[in-house]
């Protein structure tokens, strides 16, 4: 799958929007690489 | 509110280096991204690299590779492109660019830095 | 580096008109297609995300569609304010390429 800065943001955004908003703080596209997904 | 502001024009000679800033507030700096585009006048849009600012990793645009610099100021929440060896075809218009989630999922784009090269 | 080909490079319409402008990956790029509308001396405004997603704020009247190479969008119901350059970016390969814009203009 896309590896992409961009990509990434993408996919936690939709993570974040389908759990409610609820992850652990430090779940930012910063600190989360392409294996979390 | 979220906002990316530029720094001001620039004029500089052909060889010489330009600093742009993009000062972030509204959001969390250190989260997201930061995109830097250019567009050359009636020219398409031109990607030349990111950079994380949590932990400064980079990613160029080959064409920019050695001639642009990304860094970051996380205590000033402010993100520079520095493009060095300036040539008359990097004459453009430079925009910062982040896509953030929170407080607002959006991708949000500074003003723009208009950079002139000429001698 | 991944080519994005956007047609027509130009276009006249009416407002109210169905406008449709296509892009084109020169490699398979899934869904990771951006849309972006750029009015002059502005900086670019953001419209769509992974093909087919619109970020808030923007009207319903703009809408993506696409996969692989073929992405589309389009303005069901040209407004005033629509009048502007678009471009296609694909964000699935570094670098980030964009296509060569179409300009809405006012027929």
């Known amino acids: 799958s896309c590896n992409t800065a961009t990509c990434v943001t993408h996919r936690l955004a939709g993570l974040l929007s389908r759990s409610g908003g609820v992850v652990k703080d430090n779940f930012v596209p910063t600190n989360v690489g392409s294996e979390a997904f | 509110e979220v906002q990316l502001v530029q720094s001001g024009a620039e004029v500089k000679k052909p060889g010489a280096s330009v600093k742009v800033s993009c000062k972030a507030s509204?959001?969390?700096?250190?989260?997201?991204?930061m995109n830097w585009v250019r567009q050359a006048p009636g020219q398409r849009l031109e990607w030349i690299g990111d950079?994380?600012?949590?932990?400064?990793?980079?990613n160029y645009n080959q064409k920019f590779k050695g001639r642009a610099t990304l860094t970051v100021d996380k205590s000033a929440s402010t993100a520079y492109m520095e493009l060095s060896s300036l040539r008359s075809e990097d004459t453009a218009v430079y925009y910062c660019?982040?896509?953030?989630?929170?407080?607002?999922?959006?991708?949000?784009w500074g003003q723009g830095t208009t950079v002139t090269v000429s001698s | 580096d991944i080519q994005m080909t956007q047609s027509p490079s130009s276009l006249s319409a009416s407002v109210g008109d169905r406008v449709t402008i296509t892009c084109k990956a020169s490699?398979?790029?899934?869904?990771?297609v951006a849309w972006f509308q750029q009015k002059p001396g502005k900086a670019p405004k953001s419209l769509i995300y992974?093909?087919?997603y619109r970020y808030s704020g923007v009207p319903s009247r703009f809408s993506g569609s696409g996969s692989g190479t073929d992405f589309t969008l389009t303005i069901s119901s040209l407004q005033p304010e629509d009048f502007a350059t678009y471009y296609c970016?694909?964000?699935?390969?570094?670098?980030?390429?964009f296509g060569g814009g179409t300009k809405v203009e006012i027929k």
């Open positions: 992974s093909a087919s």
């Open positions: 950079i994380n600012p949590n932990n400064v990793g980079t």
């Open positions: 660019a982040s896509i953030i989630i929170v407080p607002n999922y959006f991708d949000y």
């Open positions: 490699q398979n790029v899934d869904t990771n």
């Open positions: 970016q694909q964000y699935n390969n570094y670098p980030y390429t």
């Open positions: 509204g959001y969390t700096f250190t989260d997201y991204y």
